[in-house]
């Protein structure tokens, strides 16, 4: 994300269209308290950050309130009065949606429908990953709303599920972040379990008819 202007690397994360976090890594200024100055509108005067992030006692980032802004963040990272990095960025390019809330599972024979609360903004993908101890890797299914049906499950197997939200790349571009995963939930025969056994139990022998 950060172009190297005087060796400064930046990272921007826009948490759920609520809070912007800008962090910097400036090896040349590693023992310096750089200051962060910003504005959301090209006409305003710059404000200085009031909520700095610190690393080893020195400023390394800033947290800004930016509720639901489809806007450009103009910012300047300064050593005293000297700007060491200045930029303008569309904040939504760095969106990180919040983790899914109110995740629910509705079972019907060999299928489960996973639902959760849709976020208030759009152009998102809701991804469910699942696996049984018999699977070597996670399986995945995603939809435009948090209503994902997974079919062809084995009712006898225990499955682990978790859910996350991703911003559509076609809309927000390649620099967004997926949400954190929801907690892992384990299910077997339509009932919640504490965990799925790490080593799969051997399948029951099929009785010949």
């Amino acid at each position: 994300q950060g172009g190297a202007a005087e060796g400064v690397q930046i990272q921007i994360i826009y948490f759920n269209l609520e809070t912007v976090q800008v962090t910097w890594n400036a090896s040349k200024y590693s023992r310096t308290n750089l200051t962060f100055h910003y504005r959301f509108n090209g006409d305003e005067a710059y404000d200085q950050c009031t909520n700095y992030l610190l690393q080893e006692g020195h400023t390394s980032g800033c947290l800004l309130d930016a509720e639901q802004r489809d806007d450009i963040l103009y910012f300047s990272i300064r050593n005293g009065t000297h700007p060491v990095f200045t930029a303008s960025r569309w904040m939504v390019y760095y969106l990180k949606p919040s983790s899914p809330k109110h995740v629910r599972f509705s079972w019907h024979q060999d299928a489960v429908t996973v639902t959760c609360s849709d976020l208030s903004y759009g152009d998102l993908l809701y991804e469910v990953q699942y696996r049984s101890p018999f699977d070597t890797e996670w399986q995945s299914k995603q939809e435009n709303t948090c209503n994902v049906t997974i079919e062809g499950l084995d009712a006898e197997k225990c499955y682990s599920f978790w859910v996350r939200v991703k911003a559509m790349e076609d809309v927000y571009g390649p620099d967004t972040y997926p949400s954190d995963w929801s907690e892992v939930t384990c299910w077997q025969r339509g009932e919640i379990r504490d965990a799925c056994a790490e080593t799969p139990t051997p399948p029951k022998p099929k009785l010949s008819k």
Epitope: Q1, G3, D70, A87, V92
Partner: antibody
């Protein structure tokens, strides 16, 4: 057919004012961010200003900030660029241009897929 | 502002040639880059967006690549209609264009 048609250009003295218009047709006008881009004679392209689909957010190049005002009337599918305190260096062909994307990201300005034919603004005494 | 620098400023080539135009950004712009073609007295025409996506209706001989700070526009086999001026444009923040590359007949 998607179309943009600029008007309002002409000759104006330094310090004078002018209002450009851009009439849009063939697409859902209020869903798209729109822009003005200018080109001085024999020179390259310079982005001047952008506006969100709703008109709630406007953006300006430093070279015109405080002198130009970009607005839109979505009921008339029309853009306006009010220019005051004009200078010789504002002499250019002014194009209106449509943002390529329709998304929930309402303010973001991106690539421009439809351009008008341009209107010439000459600032000279 | 982010500076966009195109090279070369002028390029002489012949029909059938493969040509490449480079655009460099003064800061990382990820993939937020577009390419335009402009002919004298005409409005620019969008060719490529998001660094490598071909705009609808644009011939497949045009292609774009790159990310971060270095980008290229390639025309695989020049056609007579391709002699024009080409501009890159970044849109990671406030828009800026490159200074242009004039592609002329050798």
């Amino acid at each position: 057919e998607v179309q943009l048609l600029e008007s309002g250009g002409g000759l104006v003295q330094p310090g004078g004012s002018l209002r450009l218009s851009c009439a849009a047709s063939g697409f859902t006008f209020s869903s798209y961010a729109m822009n003005w881009v200018r080109q001085a004679p024999g020179k390259g392209l310079e982005w001047v200003s952008g506006i969100s689909g709703s008109g709630g957010s406007t953006y300006y190049a430093d070279s015109v900030k405080g002198r130009f005002t970009f607005s839109r009337d979505n009921s008339k599918n029309t853009l306006y660029l009010q220019m005051i305190s004009l200078r010789a260096e504002d002499t250019a062909v002014y194009y209106c241009a449509k943002d390529q994307r329709i998304t929930m990201v309402r303010g973001v300005i991106g690539a421009f897929d439809i351009w008008g034919q341009g209107t010439m603004v000459t600032v000279s005494s | 502002d982010i500076q966009m620098t195109q090279s070369p400023s002028t390029l002489s080539a012949s029909v059938g040639d493969r040509v490449t135009i480079t655009c460099r950004a003064s800061q990382s712009i990820s993939s937020w880059l577009a390419w335009y073609q402009q002919k004298p007295g005409k409005a620019p025409k969008l060719l490529i967006y998001k660094a490598s996506s071909l705009e609808s209706g644009v011939p497949s001989r045009f292609s774009g690549s790159g990310s971060g700070t270095e980008f290229t526009l390639t025309i695989s086999s020049l056609q007579p209609d391709d002699f024009a001026t080409y501009y890159c444009q970044q849109y990671v923040g406030l828009i800026t264009f490159g200074q242009g590359t004039r592609l002329e007949i050798k």
